[in-house]
Interface confidence: medium
């Protein structure tokens, strides 16, 4: 026997809601970065310690790490950075980035969040001369809950409760389970106003029947998690020239591209430095 | 070659309008916001604020808000700065600039082209 | 906005004397620091970003350093051309503000 079918514009638009968490933080249009921020989503509550991990796929030996807030209005507020092998707080010391013994992953973490802590953040990276190159990675998102303080009862301790990487698995488990509540919900308000599916009646698919293939089987749905934007780059990815008193030395400013494309452009040699006046 | 080449020296009366401009050449004007900085005669450098190419998007600093205003002809790569309302402390040589990276929001906005400068004196 | 305070403001050194100016920011401003050139009737010249980072062509007489609130940059061995006005910027923060300048002259 088979089940009721949903028809398609319902799925979607229950799994469209299934992936809402990773949805809010994704644009098709910004450009591939190979900084990346993680987890995209991180809940703590107030007063512990929220850590995001910034990886560098491949680390120079000269090179500058920061961490930024951004606010609505596009202003960052670097909040630490992190040179040739110290960090460096910024203004608010609760704010560290601790290089981890693999060499290309930094622990960005808010000592004691607090709830004006939630917010967008990032890291960026610049790589240092001789091969210069600009980076920014993916933005994630935190929240701070407040702690609320229940009287004490007689009931059994909450489960312990999993914060830092541990609340993106909950993030998108939690949001797989709410499409599938969702989907199950549909199916049976579906089945409840059409009897006529529940009678097998031409509606239901034999379970010998795989779901024909082709022009008109059902669309695929793909979820890129990608970053948050808010037409936040000023510009379309283009190396700069560097605008220099002599043709000495030519930069590469690598600007992230699209997954597959050809990588670090170089500096255009026409662009040419420009003149310091005699 | 990367130049920002400025308009010429302008000599004007207090309450009088002057409108200097800033031509881009040797690279995508769209790519990098140009800013402008004003330094009065044996005095320092005062950033004025900065405007997005891509948008048209100004931002002033404080200090020019008013009677300030940036724009641009991005069909001729130039930017504009335009004073309202002249006053004899705006005399100054005013520079426009563009940031050495591309501009992505972590970029260091130091600045690596500068135009020649436009002196503007103000004197009734 | 952040105020940046330079030091010295006048400085009198003969050819092949080791120069230091400092900078100092009213609050942190990170690593985002950066220096310049004026020579008389110029437009200024990017010497050093990110506090320590020499740009493109600069000869490796210029260094800075510094992170936070304070800030030095330094000529290790002055020559005669590099008789100018030096200035600090911080670009952590909008307004980008500079330093009031340092001149130096050469004996």
């Known amino acids: 026997m088979g089940t009721p079918r949903a028809p398609w514009p319902l799925v979607w638009a229950v799994l469209q809601l299934g992936w809402w968490p990773g949805w809010l933080l994704d644009s098709p249009y910004r450009p591939w970065s190979p900084l990346t921020f993680s987890p995209a989503q991180l809940t703590v509550l107030e007063g512990e310690n929220a850590t995001f991990v910034c990886h560098l796929p491949d680390v120079p030996e000269s090179f500058v790490l920061n961490w930024y807030r951004v606010s609505p209005r596009n202003q960052t507020d670097k909040l630490a950075a992190f040179q040739e092998n110290h960090t460096e707080p910024g203004k608010d010391r609760r704010f560290r980035v601790t290089r981890l013994p693999s060499g290309q992953d930094f622990h960005t973490t808010i000592l004691a969040a607090q709830l004006n802590d939630s917010g967008i953040y990032l890291c960026g990276a610049i790589y240092l001369p001789p091969n210069t190159q600009i980076y920014e990675s993916p933005r994630a998102e935190l929240t701070v809950k407040e702690r609320v303080l229940e009287p004490p009862t007689e009931s059994p301790s909450p489960p312990p409760r999993l914060t830092g990487q541990g609340q993106g698995l909950v993030v998108g488990v939690t949001s797989v389970l709410v499409g599938v509540l969702l989907l199950l919900l549909l199916t049976w308000v579906l089945a409840a106003a059409f009897p006529r599916a529940t009678r097998g009646a031409c509606a239901c698919g034999s379970e010998d029947e795989p779901l024909k293939e082709g022009p008109s089987a059902a669309p695929v749905f793909t979820v890129d998690y990608g970053e948050l934007d808010f037409q936040w780059r000023e510009k379309t990815p283009e190396p700069p020239a560097p605008c220099a008193p002599e043709q000495t030395e030519y930069a590469t400013i690598v600007f992230p591209s699209r997954p597959g494309s050809p990588g670090p452009l170089p500096l255009r040699p026409e662009d040419g430095p420009c003149p310091w006046p005699l | 070659q990367i130049q920002l080449v400025q308009s010429g020296p302008e000599l004007k009366k207090p309450g009088e309008t002057v409108k200097i401009s800033c031509k881009a050449s040797?690279?995508?004007?769209?790519?990098?916001?140009i800013h402008w900085v004003k330094q009065a005669p044996g005095k320092g450098l005062k950033w004025m604020g900065w405007i997005n190419t891509e948008t048209g998007e100004p931002t002033y600093a404080d200090d020019f808000k008013g009677r300030f205003a940036f724009s641009l002809e991005t069909s001729v790569s130039a930017a504009f700065l335009q004073i309202n309302n002249l006053k004899n402390e705006d005399t100054a040589t005013y520079f426009c600039a563009r940031p050495l990276f591309y501009y992505y929001i972590t970029s260091p906005r130091s600045m690596d082209c500068w135009g020649q400068g436009t002196s503007v004196s103000v004197s009734s | 906005s952040i105020v940046m305070t330079q030091t010295p403001k006048f400085l009198l050194v003969s050819a092949g004397d080791r120069v230091t100016i400092t900078c100092k920011a009213s609050q942190s401003v990170t690593n985002d620091v950066a220096w310049y050139q004026q020579k008389p009737g110029q437009s200024p010249k990017l010497l050093i970003y990110y506090a320590s980072n020499r740009y493109t062509g600069v000869p490796d007489r210029f260094t800075g350093s510094g992170y936070g609130t304070d800030f030095t940059f330094t000529i290790s061995t002055v020559q005669a051309e590099d008789l100018a006005v030096y200035f600090c910027?911080?670009?952590?923060?909008?307004?980008?503000?500079f330093g009031g300048g340092t001149m130096l002259e050469i004996k």
């Open positions: 040797g690279y995508t004007f769209t790519d990098y916001s």
């Open positions: 910027q911080q670009d952590y923060s909008s307004p980008y503000t």
